[in-house]
């Protein structure tokens, strides 16, 4: 039969930042084509990507519906341009993904500093608190909505004219911090989740210094 | 289980130097902080410093600012205190240590178990 | 620099003693101090983080208080293995820093 070339998928990984959630896999295909399917440990299978030559499927939508359930997927090779064709067992071939908890798996995002404001010696920074693709009633929820206090940022600062990083953390998204009067700063923030054993830390965000736009200077 | 091991210790002659380790097990390095802590003979305890082997990101107490530098090899899983211009007052037990989060609060919940750096001619 | 000022710097207890050692800080710390218990040879232990909360596996004869900016270490019933000297420690800001130390003797 034709199915003596289907192969079955291989190396499939969970990639998701943010809660932005893609699975992708191996082989490139050569006639055969993949669908996938996710449930929760307790569903359902759900039919996503079907019949694609792609090797990567979104799987965003399903999976926002609860970030802290555990979710897998499975992916189907089928013969190109005869996907009613099965295996030998009469099951088409099929290989299950690790197991994939959104809200303890997920990778930070790289923050952003929103903003900064100097008001003589003390500095207030604040971390734009970016937006998931997680709903509530209807509306996008933010990476604190999600996280609560489970979620803290850590702020790395220090002079212009040195390389020392003082830090500061804070489990909202501003800090006030304590700087030498008529020194520049310079500040980078990175987001933890501390209760979690891995994807802990997010990458630093850009570096922002006073003396630029983002900033304000106030004398008092 | 989680265990830091120090290495690298020893007798140095002041002006000279050292490079001491703290080697991981159990648990990542980048996803915390590592400090590096030093006991001289008889004394209280005193921070030396720390690095996020994530970013490396470093600070120094000021009385080793410019003569100690921390650095890390996430694949070795394994911190280093590079120690020069040794003097006397620098003789003590040298402990890494490992930083977590309760909250924003930070806690070192494991330490090596030192090791011992003389500084003497 | 925020310094730990940390008294006594030594007592004398018998077991069954309570047990209470002090640090304040030179400015507000919020809960951002730590006890840890060190014996002759031995690293730190960590005892109290967050001011009150008791480390995993600690002995619920310790306890940690705040009041302001002043921060308390009671020892319940002092217990032979509790000889040994304790340290406060402030990480609310760069750089961390330590108490003097309290070294609790046998009386």
């Known amino acids: 039969s034709g199915t003596t070339n289907t192969v079955a998928a291989y190396n499939l990984t969970w990639k998701s930042t943010n809660f932005k959630t893609i699975l992708e896999w191996e082989p490139k295909p050569v006639n055969q084509v993949y669908t996938v399917q996710i449930s929760t440990k307790s569903g359902d299978w759900k039919s996503k990507c079907f019949y694609t030559t792609d090797t990567e499927c979104d799987l965003t939508d399903e999976i926002v519906k609860d970030v802290k359930q555990t979710y897998l997927a499975r992916v189907f090779s089928y013969p190109a341009g005869n996907v009613e064709s099965t295996g030998s067992a009469g099951e088409p071939l099929y290989e299950n993904s690790p197991e994939f908890t959104p809200y303890l798996e997920t990778n930070l995002g790289q923050p952003t500093i929103q903003s900064f404001e100097q008001v003589g010696t003390k500095v207030n920074v604040t971390v734009e608190d970016e937006r998931t693709l997680v709903r509530r009633n209807n509306t996008f929820l933010s990476l604190r909505d999600v996280f609560g206090k489970d979620l803290i940022y850590t702020l790395y600062y220090w002079k212009s004219s040195s390389s020392g990083k003082k830090t500061a953390k804070t489990n909202t998204n501003e800090f006030l911090i304590d700087v030498d009067k008529g020194e520049n700063y310079c500040f980078s923030v990175q987001a933890v989740i501390p209760s979690r054993t891995v994807n802990r830390k997010s990458t630093d965000s850009p570096v922002e210094c006073m003396g630029q736009e983002k900033g304000e200077f106030r004398e008092i | 289980e989680v265990q830091l091991v120090e290495s690298g210790g020893g007798l140095v002659q002041p002006g000279g130097s050292l490079r001491l380790s703290c080697a991981a097990s159990?648990?990542?390095?980048?996803?915390?902080?590592i400090h590096w802590v030093r006991q001289a003979p008889g004394k209280g305890l005193e921070w030396v410093g720390y690095i996020d082997p994530y970013n490396g990101a470093t600070y120094y107490a000021d009385s080793v600012k410019g003569r100690f530098t921390i650095s890390a090899d996430t694949p070795k899983n394994t911190a280093y205190l590079q120690m020069n211009s040794l003097r006397a007052e620098d003789t003590a037990v040298y402990y890494c240590?490992?930083?977590?989060?309760?909250?924003?609060?930070?806690?070192?919940?494991?330490w090596g178990q030192g090791t011992l750096v003389t500084v003497s001619s | 620099d925020i310094q730990m000022t940390q008294s006594p710097s030594s007592l004398s207890a018998s077991v069954g003693d309570r047990v209470t050692i002090t640090c304040r800080a030179s400015q507000d710390v919020n809960t951002a101090v730590a006890w840890y218990q060190q014996k002759p040879g031995k690293a730190p232990k960590l005892l109290i983080y967050?001011?009150?909360f008791l480390y995993s596996g600690v002995p619920s004869r310790f306890s940690g208080s705040r009041s302001g900016t002043d921060f308390t270490l009671t020892i319940s019933s002092l217990q032979p293995e509790d000889f040994a000297t304790y340290y406060c420690q402030q990480h609310y800001t760069t750089p961390p820093t330590f108490g003097q130390g309290t070294k609790v003797e046998i009386k």
């Open positions: 967050s001011a009150s």
């Open positions: 159990g648990f990542t390095i980048s996803g915390y902080w």
């Open positions: 240590a490992r930083a977590d989060y309760h909250g924003v609060d930070e806690y070192w919940d494991y």
